[in-house]
């Protein structure tokens, strides 16, 4: 029948931060194509990467439409130059991926600080609002657009001249922090979605130092 | 189900040093914050600092700054805290808590520390 | 470092009175206040996360409040059990600080 010599994907995984989203499978095809389906629970099946030999295929498109929902997809596997050949039960064999919910399982992607600014004996600390690939009225949302106050920020801070570090919280994308007179800090933050079991904290951003040029002072 | 086990009861000398464990089980310790507080006998709660097991940052009170180091082996899932030039006043009940971000939400039961000579 | 002024100290209650206890911070908090019991001999319990939200398993006559510096824990119909101390936590910004605490005594 042609189709001896295909075998099912496996090790299917969702790869997905900040909502762009990647389904990775295995083998390396040979003698052998793929095509990817993926659905939500209640919805329809809707192929995707159509006769592939790749591994992967971005499924960004779908899951934005609705990043709450709960996806399934699925890779049948084909003969390769005999595409409309099947299985043995009729069928293309095909393998599931697990269950996928963006909102509750992208990976937060690491932060970047876009500034600081020291007035005084504060500084205010803000961190860039990600742009994100999910879109409402033909406009795409930031991540704090898509999370609200689910999604807060962790920053450390600490002399430059000592190891003490200190941490604070919030809500927004600005921190607003005391600090001595005369003394340089250096930054770094975290995301957070408190309310998450699962891939709840992102990586650190870089570090940003006072007496860079990002930041800005003002003695007032 | 969530759990943090401290290590048991302790007598230490003045001057000496403790290191207490907190062994954490149903979550990764490393997707959370780990924090120590204490409680002095008829006294309110107290933050001693607290630790991100996925990066090492530790932040202590100012007033424990020098004595007190807090870690995590997160291959063990477990948090530790040593308190350094013990003196009688640190004797109190050392709690382990899970920080969610929103709260502490899941605490040890507790590990007394007695200083005496 | 923020203070955390609990109020107040102690407060002596019958079964079904209304208790109210407020913590007032030094600053803002943005919400980062976390109010627990605790019973002699315990560890501490949590009630209320990140101002208002009620913990799992905790009784819905538990009820936060508040924003910015003022903060409130409500018990609208107190039962025996709920004879403890109670403490708030601003978790905002380090060194976390706890307020004094509210012992809530049988009258």
């Known amino acids: 029948s042609g189709t001896t010599n295909t075998v099912a994907a496996y090790n299917l995984t969702w790869k997905s931060t900040n909502f762009k989203t990647i389904l990775e499978w295995e083998p390396k095809p040979v003698n052998q194509v793929y095509t990817v389906q993926i659905s939500t629970k209640s919805g329809d099946w809707k192929s995707k990467c159509f006769y592939t030999t790749d591994t992967e295929c971005d499924l960004t498109d779908e899951i934005v439409k609705d990043v709450k929902q709960t996806y399934l997809a699925r890779v049948f596997s084909y003969p390769a130059g005999n595409v409309e050949s099947t299985g043995s039960a009729g069928e293309p064999l095909y393998e599931n991926s697990p269950e996928f919910t963006p909102y509750l399982e992208t990976n937060l992607g690491q932060p970047t600080i876009q500034s600081f600014e020291q007035v005084g004996t504060k500084v205010n600390v803000t961190v860039e609002d990600e742009r994100t690939l999910v879109r409402r009225n033909n406009t795409f949302l930031s991540l704090r657009d898509v999370f609200g106050k689910d999604l807060i920020y962790t920053l450390y801070y600490w002399k430059s001249s000592s190891s003490g570090k200190k941490t604070a919280k919030t809500n927004t994308n600005e921190f607003l922090i005391d600090v001595d007179k005369g003394e340089n800090y250096c930054f770094s933050v975290q995301a957070v979605i408190p309310s998450r079991t699962v891939n709840r904290k992102s990586t650190d951003s870089p570090v940003e130092c006072m007496g860079q040029e990002k930041g800005e002072f003002r003695e007032i | 189900q969530v759990q943090l086990l401290e290590s048991g009861a302790v007598l230490a000398r003045p001057g000496t040093s403790v290191k207490i464990s907190c062994k954490a089980s149903g979550f990764n310790i490393k997707d959370y914050y780990m924090h120590w507080v204490r409680q002095a006998p008829g006294q309110g709660l107290e933050w001693i600092g607290g630790n991100d097991p996925a990066n090492g940052h530790s932040m202590y009170d100012p007033k424990f700054q020098g004595r007190v180091t807090i870690t995590a082996d997160t291959s063990t899932n477990t948090a530790y805290m040593e308190l350094s030039s013990l003196r009688s006043e640190d004797t109190a009940i050392y709690y382990c808590a899970r920080d969610s971000g929103y709260a502490m939400d899941y605490w040890g039961q507790g590990t007394l520390v007695t200083v005496s000579s | 470092d923020i203070q955390m002024t609990q109020s107040p100290s102690s407060l002596s209650a019958s079964v079904g009175d209304r208790v109210t206890i407020t913590c007032k911070a030094s600053?803002?908090?943005?919400?980062?206040l976390s109010w627990y019991q605790q019973k002699p001999g315990k560890a501490p319990k949590l009630l209320i996360y990140y101002a208002t939200s009620l913990a799992d398993g905790v009784p819905s006559r538990f009820s936060g409040s508040g924003s910015g510096t003022d903060y409130t824990l409500t018990i609208s119909s107190l039962q025996p059990e709920d004879f403890a101390t109670y403490y708030c936590?601003?978790?905002?910004?380090?060194?976390?600080?706890f307020g004094g605490g509210t012992k809530v005594e049988i009258k």
């Open positions: 600053q803002d908090i943005k919400s980062f």
């Open positions: 936590l601003q978790h905002g910004e380090s060194p976390y600080t």
